[in-house]
Amino acid sequence: EEELQVIQPDKSISVAAGESATLHCTVTSLIPVGPIQWFRGAGPGRELIYNQKEGHFPRVTTVSDLTKRNNMDFSIRISNITPADAGTYYCVKFRKGSPDHVEFKSGAGTELSVRAKPSAPVVSGPAARATPQHTVSFTCESHGFSPRDITLKWFKNGNELSDFQTNVDPAGDSVSYSIHSTAKVVLTREDVHSQVICEVAHVTLQGDPLRGTANLSETIRVPPTLEVTQQPVRAENQVNVTCQVRKFYPQRLQLTWLENGNVSRTETASTLTENKDGTYNWMSWLLVNVSAHRDDVKLTCQVEHDGQPAVSKSHDLKVSAHPKEQGSNTAPGPALASAAPL
């Protein structure tokens, strides 16, 4: 009779993480008598996966009933596969011996690779806000996937970006991998409502890529533009001076009125008007009593936006004997009246 052979028909198999892996093994003869054992790897550090005769292997079940006398199928099923289970599995026939069984024949081995889904991509932006026309970097990370092949794309408001660099680690084979990508994005004044999207496609996702997003509202700072104007009011001796603070983001803003360099009033922006592009407008006004001063007065609207250095716009009120003849930029003998924001 021909000598027993151990047949492992599958050179390699691929299994999704969390599923079960079936490792096939048959023998061609019932002789010699002796058990089967399964190992992962070979060499001095090989790992026992299943022993037919003894031991507790909670994740391993046999496909056939090994207690049947004529059984020649020693296939096993390993449940709840993780990337750490990847490797080459050997079905080894032992010959009955005393006191120990003796290794007799080995199968050729089955290489198990594990497919694992990538984690949801996490997109993070810069720690500090940046202003339009500046380039900022966004990072995207996803972990725990296998096999190594993966595709990552960046989008801004649906438009694919091209300025990015991606690394998959480790460089060589591993039980699982991580991807890290950095994209450069040029900010514009219209980006308050914009989104940056990182999209990851992998064989385990069956054509339904994972996405991570970052809102540019958390990254952008749009500095305000200031305009100071005056309009006469019905009372002859009063002028209404307004400071229009336009197109700023985020909302955090403090405004100070100065009269000839001296602080007159400070207020924090509260009731704001939102523009379509997500930026805000605000207006503060002063009623100026023109009868109290003989000299010209410089009025300054000073704005501190989002903790940045203050910006200001000044307006000269010129003293004149004929207040009704003043142009829109001057008024005689100013004095600051009690005024409130709109």
Partner: antibody, heavy 123, light 106 residues
Framework: QIQLVQSGPELKKPGETVKISCRAS????????MSWVKQAPGKGLRWMGW????????TCADDFKGRFAFSLETSATTAYLQIHNLTNEDTATYFC????????????????WGQGTLVTVSA | IVMTQSQKFMSTTIRDRVSITCKAS??????VAWYQQKSGQSPKLLIY???NRYTGVPDRFTGSGSGTDFTLTISNMQSEDLADYFC?????????FGSGTKLAIK
């Protein structure tokens, strides 16, 4: 196809140091362990030890502890053998040899070998 | 573990059947491989797990044995088979090779 290409022959004086490279291609470098094997002229093969290319951890056979070091440059898919304080007995051909098993935690047999690097130590 | 190849040289003829033996100093199960090495070349794997023929190796090469006694058989000797043959155990550290058997034509 899978290839292991070693650096060229070296002529060294006793007491010097030699560093041999083994550049791997055709497979993913960090999946498979790399062993080093010595063959003195007209002699048999001696396993010197191996390096786990994933973790970078190396194991030296007792006879090769002390003057022998294994290292990696993963980005260049290259393994290195360095021998310090060379003696005449180090004159040999040194082979790198790749393990058959992905994610193996010990070497076994060697399906792939470099072409060998002859190191000659002579005063 | 010492792997002993007692025959340093073996004379053979083309189409002959040749058996090269290797003895382990202790039980190594079937953790044995066989290599062929031609002059000036690196070793080439023939057999692993004592009896499994490696991919692409002609079927005239057969391995057998377990425990301590192992044999590599060439059933139909060819001129290209003239080489040195080494056994190797990988049952325990350090991995060890036999001293080799050189096949030559009678």
């Amino acid at each position: 196809q899978i290839q292991l290409v070693q650096s060229g022959p070296e002529l060294k004086k006793p007491g010097e140091t030699v560093k041999i490279s083994c550049r791997a291609s055709g497979y993913t470098f960090t999946t498979y362990g790399m062993s080093w094997v010595k063959q003195a002229p007209g002699k048999g093969l001696r396993w010197m030890g191996w390096i786990n290319t994933y973790s970078g951890v190396s194991t030296c056979a007792d006879d090769f502890k002390g003057r022998f070091a294994f290292s990696l440059e993963t980005s260049a898919t290259t393994a290195y053998l360095q021998i310090h304080n060379l003696t005449n007995e180090d004159t040999a051909t040194y082979f790198c040899a790749r393990d058959p098993h992905s994610y193996g935690n010990s070497p076994a047999w060697f399906p792939y070998w470099g072409q060998g690097t002859l190191v000659t130590v002579s005063a | 573990i010492v792997m002993t190849q007692s025959q340093k040289f073996m004379s053979t003829t083309i189409r002959d059947r040749v058996s090269i033996t290797c003895k382990a100093s202790q039980n190594v199960g079937i953790s044995v491989a066989w290599y062929q090495q031609k002059s000036g070349q690196s070793p080439k794997l023939l057999i692993y797990s004592a009896s499994n023929r490696y991919t692409g190796v002609p079927d005239r090469f057969t391995g057998s044995g377990s425990g301590t006694d192992f044999t590599l058989t060439i059933s139909n000797m060819q001129s290209e088979d003239l080489a040195d043959y080494f056994c190797q155990q990988y049952s325990s550290y350090p991995l060890t090779f036999g001293s080799g058997t050189k096949l030559a034509i009678k």
